[in-house]
């Protein structure tokens, strides 16, 4: 394991930290290098350094090493914050315990077991000896510190300052005795960095010799510091990947603390009637799986042998045969008493909060095979076999029937927004399930965002309605009224459907809303001939996080010279940068004598990366957002415009490419607006229009 070792594992890392020497006599050495690993190797071997290297700083910006003969505990030194620096301190010099015989111990204990002060190694008084620092290079025979240069049985020792006692061992504890954990060590944040067989642990931020998913930046709450033993995944006790290429991982020997209590911060919220999160804190007495099969006792090995015993999983309350989640599974589960069914989830236990999905999916969830069977609004899913006719109506291939079992949430139509199910409720034929994408899953659902692959326009003809070119007509613009006042804009995309923003509906009482169509003046003055006033019959909320709503009108709008629909873009399309677009709204204009007339502001499309730069890097845009900058300083959407459209033209066809939503501020000079990207949600819109029933005119 020592052959061509990667010595960075022997260092404790403190990110964004450097050491400043207050004492000018302290030496340092610097050199340009590529990686922190190179600094570590040189520090460990003391190669070409005029001192014993105890720590180094890697300057990431300048790609430079600064080697030190001191560390953060030395006098004449202070720690300082610095974005570009990472401090690495040799653990041997800061450890206050020993591993094995303590051959590598380089701490500062200088008193023997019986309390006698140690004699300095460079002195021959009171005892003459041959253990000279010059003869034992690398063994750090400094000052009068306890050492074990030959790796002898008793551990670190020293010659004593008492002429009567030549030498004596020092009372330095084993690291395995100092380190202790509670329960199964999920909250352990100690400094044990080797396994129970003595193998050195691999750093969590390294992928060699073993590739793994536990990246510190992906799991900031798991304590993945340096190469210390941890228990991120509900194992019986802490473990680590090892530096031995033939041993992927091994448990660490960390004893249970005498006072086996958990910190409040480590305890999952205990519930007895329902599941919070993934149900790790569920302590109720449900003892059957979802279909009624009784659970096997946790302390029994019949009919299924297992290691999920109360002894292995202390603090997980593995009492009797109650459903529990000791290992961070999707939800509480148990071994079953049926010899043919090893385990089953207790999915009949309700969620304390439906919004916390107890499950996750990858990509768009088309391979999701979990057993959640409830929509995000709490409706029970209906059986797939009862809905096959409806499913065939909106997909053009044969769905995989083997996946469509029972009434579980699935994604048979390749929906971009995750698993869903039919509900059996005629008003809400189907809805998404409260399942999120798995943490760290970055599979894009649309690729090549900034490269125009798919055209947004469906056709290349100029569409004309009643002899009036739609490009001069804004009949698709809707004024959403709340308690008789204009509150938001919206776009008529079909006779019965208006696309708008989720935030435009403060009340749940649909009687509080109306849609005005065919108007130019926000108060409807002079628009009496052309105005259509329609009630709202339903709100269909967009996929989680979309901020979109499809508002169903109580009766279809009548399309005429003043009221028209606007086209949707193709799903996943990209509109070229610098395309000229417009936003429309009756919102706040910044004028004191606001005349209430529909306003337009001209914007141009900007790529997501460029847009992020304009926002000084404070916003990262994703595939569900589109950005447009103002041609005129300070023109753009504001309060009262929310829900309204960003309209662009391609091949002489006008489309709604964006929806104005709160959260990105009113039009600030040099700050482009960020809109919900309709193309990303186009399939969802079509699916709703196709599957939700609307009143006939």
């Amino acid at each position: 394991q020592r052959k061509r070792r990667n010595t960075i594992h022997e260092f404790k890392k403190s990110a964004k930290t450097t050491l400043i020497k207050i004492d000018p006599a302290l030496k340092i050495k610097t050199k340009k290098v590529n990686t922190a690993d190179q600094c570590a190797n040189r520090c460990t071997r003391n190669k070409g350094l005029p001192f014993t290297c105890k720590a180094f700083v890697f300057d990431k910006a300048r790609k430079q090493c600064l080697w030190f003969p001191f560390n953060s505990m030395s006098s004449g030194v202070k720690k300082e914050f610095g974005h570009e620096f990472d401090l690495y301190e040799n653990k041997d010099y800061i450890r206050n315990c020993i591993i094995g015989k303590g051959r590598s111990y380089k701490g500062t204990v200088s008193i023997t077991k019986s309390g006698i002060k140690c004699q300095p190694w460079s002195s021959m008084i009171p005892h003459e000896h041959s253990f000279l620092p010059s003869s034992y290079r690398g063994k750090d025979l400094q000052e009068n510190y306890c050492r074990n240069p030959r790796g002898e049985e008793g551990g670190p020792w020293c010659f004593t300052s008492n002429p009567e006692v030549r030498y004596e061992v020092c009372d330095i504890p084993q690291c395995s005795e100092v380190e202790c954990m509670t329960c199964n060590g999920e909250s352990y944040r100690g400094l044990m960095d080797h396994t129970e067989s003595g193998k050195i642990c691999q750093r969590w931020d390294h992928q060699t010799p073993h590739r793994h998913k536990f990246l510190p930046e992906r799991y900031p709450d798991k304590g993945f510091d340096d190469n210390y033993c941890r228990n991120p995944d509900g194992q019986p006790r802490p473990w680590c990947y090892t530096l031995d290429p033939h041993t992927r991982w091994e448990y660490c020997a960390i004893k249970t603390c005498a006072d086996n209590t958990m910190n409040d911060t480590d305890v999952p919220l205990e519930t007895t009637e329902c599941i919070q999160g993934q149900g790790e804190g569920y302590r109720g007495t449900v003892n059957t799986i979802w279909n009624g099969i009784p659970c096997q006792r946790w302390d029994s090995q019949y009919p299924h042998e297992h290691d999920m015993t109360p002894e292995n999983f202390k603090c997980k309350d593995l009492r009797e045969n109650y459903c529990r989640n000791p290992d961070g599974s999707e939800s509480p589960w148990c071994f079953t008493t049926d010899p043919n069914i090893r385990v089953g989830y207790c999915s009949q236990i309700p969620n304390c909060d439906m919004s916390h999905g107890q499950d996750c999916y990858r990509g768009n969830g088309k391979n999701y095979m979990g057993n959640l069977s409830q929509t995000r609004s709490g409706l029970t899913c209906s059986m797939w076999d009862k809905n096959m006719e409806d499913l065939h109506r909106h997909i053009f291939w044969e769905p995989d029937a083997s996946k469509l079992n029972e009434n579980y949430c699935r994604n048979p139509d390749d929906d971009a927004h995750g698993p869903w199910c039919y509900t059996g409720n005629p008003l809400i034929p189907w809805d998404y399930c409260p399942i999120s994408r798995c943490e760290g899953d970055t599979t894009p659902t649309i690729v090549n965002l900034d490269h125009p692959v798919i055209s947004c326009a469906k056709t290349k003809q100029l569409r004309v309605v009643n002899g009036i070119p739609t490009r001069t007509n804004i009949g698709w613009m809707v004024s959403l009224r709340y308690r008789n006042k204009h509150i938001c804009g919206g776009s008529l995309i079909k006779e019965s459907w208006v696309l708008t923003a989720r935030q435009c509906f403060p009340s749940r009482d649909l009687k509080d809303y109306e849609a005005w169509l065919g108007i130019h003046d926000v108060h409807g003055r002079g628009d009496e001939k052309c105005k259509q006033v329609l009630n709202v019959s339903q709100l269909v909320y967009g996929p989680e996080g979309s901020d979109l709503v499809l508002m169903k009108l109580a009766r279809p709008a009548v399309l005429d010279d003043f009221v028209s629909t606007i086209d949707l873009p193709n799903y996943g399309c990209t509109i070229p940068e610098k395309t000229s677009c417009s936003v429309y709204g009756w919102g706040y204009t910044g004028l004191i004598n606001y005349d209430g007339l529909l306003r337009v502001a001209h914007l141009y499309i900007m790529g997501n990366e460029k847009c992020s730069q304009h926002h000084r890097g404070k916003v990262t845009l994703n595939e569900s957002e589109i950005c447009a900058g103002a041609e005129k300083i300070g023109s753009g959407p504001c309060e009262g415009d929310y829900g309204g459209p960003l309209v662009c033209e391609q091949h002489k066809m006008r489309m709604v490419l964006g929806v104005i939503v709160p959260g990105r501020g009113c039009a600030i000079p040099n700050r482009p607006g960020i809109f919900v990207r309709v193309a990303y949600y186009a399939k969802w819109i079509h699916k709703i229009i196709l599957t939700y029933k609307v009143p006939q005119s």
Epitope: R483, R502, Q503, F505, P506, D509
Partner: antibody, heavy 115, light 110 residues
Framework: SVEESGGRLVMPGTPLTLTCTVS????????ISWVRQAPEKGLEWIGV?????VTDYASWAQGRFTISKTSTTVDLKIPSPTTEDTATYFC?????????????WGPGTLVTVSS | AYDMTQTPASVEVAVGGTVTIKCQAS??????LAWYQQKPGQPPKLLIY???KLASGVPSRFSGSGSGTQFTLTISGVECADAATYYC????????????FGGGTEVVVK
Amino acid sequence: SVEESGGRLVMPGTPLTLTCTVSGFSLSSNAISWVRQAPEKGLEWIGVIYVIGVTDYASWAQGRFTISKTSTTVDLKIPSPTTEDTATYFCARVYDSGWNHFNLWGPGTLVTVSS
Amino acid sequence: AYDMTQTPASVEVAVGGTVTIKCQASQSISSWLAWYQQKPGQPPKLLIYEASKLASGVPSRFSGSGSGTQFTLTISGVECADAATYYCQQAYSVANVDNAFGGGTEVVVK
């Protein structure tokens, strides 16, 4: 967190503005409500300002109070306080952007209207 | 209007006992109801939302039920720390509302 300020002793008819300062969340994600409690009395809802800037008031509070906001503060203006307006005034974060339950409350600020 | 009526105004209960507080809406509010606990000198604290969902960190001895116009808050295995005033609040609509809160129920623990 949310925290109220501006509560003090005022004469009847002297305009008063209370401010709710928010941190750790954005007013573009959550609505904010004002609630008051007269000494030894129950909670009385005054009004709410939604994410989109629209306001709603209790029927008795309409015209007596005005709620407005900036990016990090929400103001409650009492243009002409009366002795009946003596109370502790709370601002509360509404769960979500519209009307809903209140999942975060400030400690309150005391307004005393007296001549 | 969606106004709320809470009963009783006050209730006395022994440690370990169970207390039930009722809240009635003037018209249906589906499940859009929340319950709060308030102790003297403190702001209210959310206990239950959407009629039956337990807020984060709230002990499971608190439970809520009901929908439409009739709602109940139950505290079982009452502890001394539960002595407080409890309020319901409708989270449905504020059109022409006088008060979104119920009048409150004082719980005295013996």
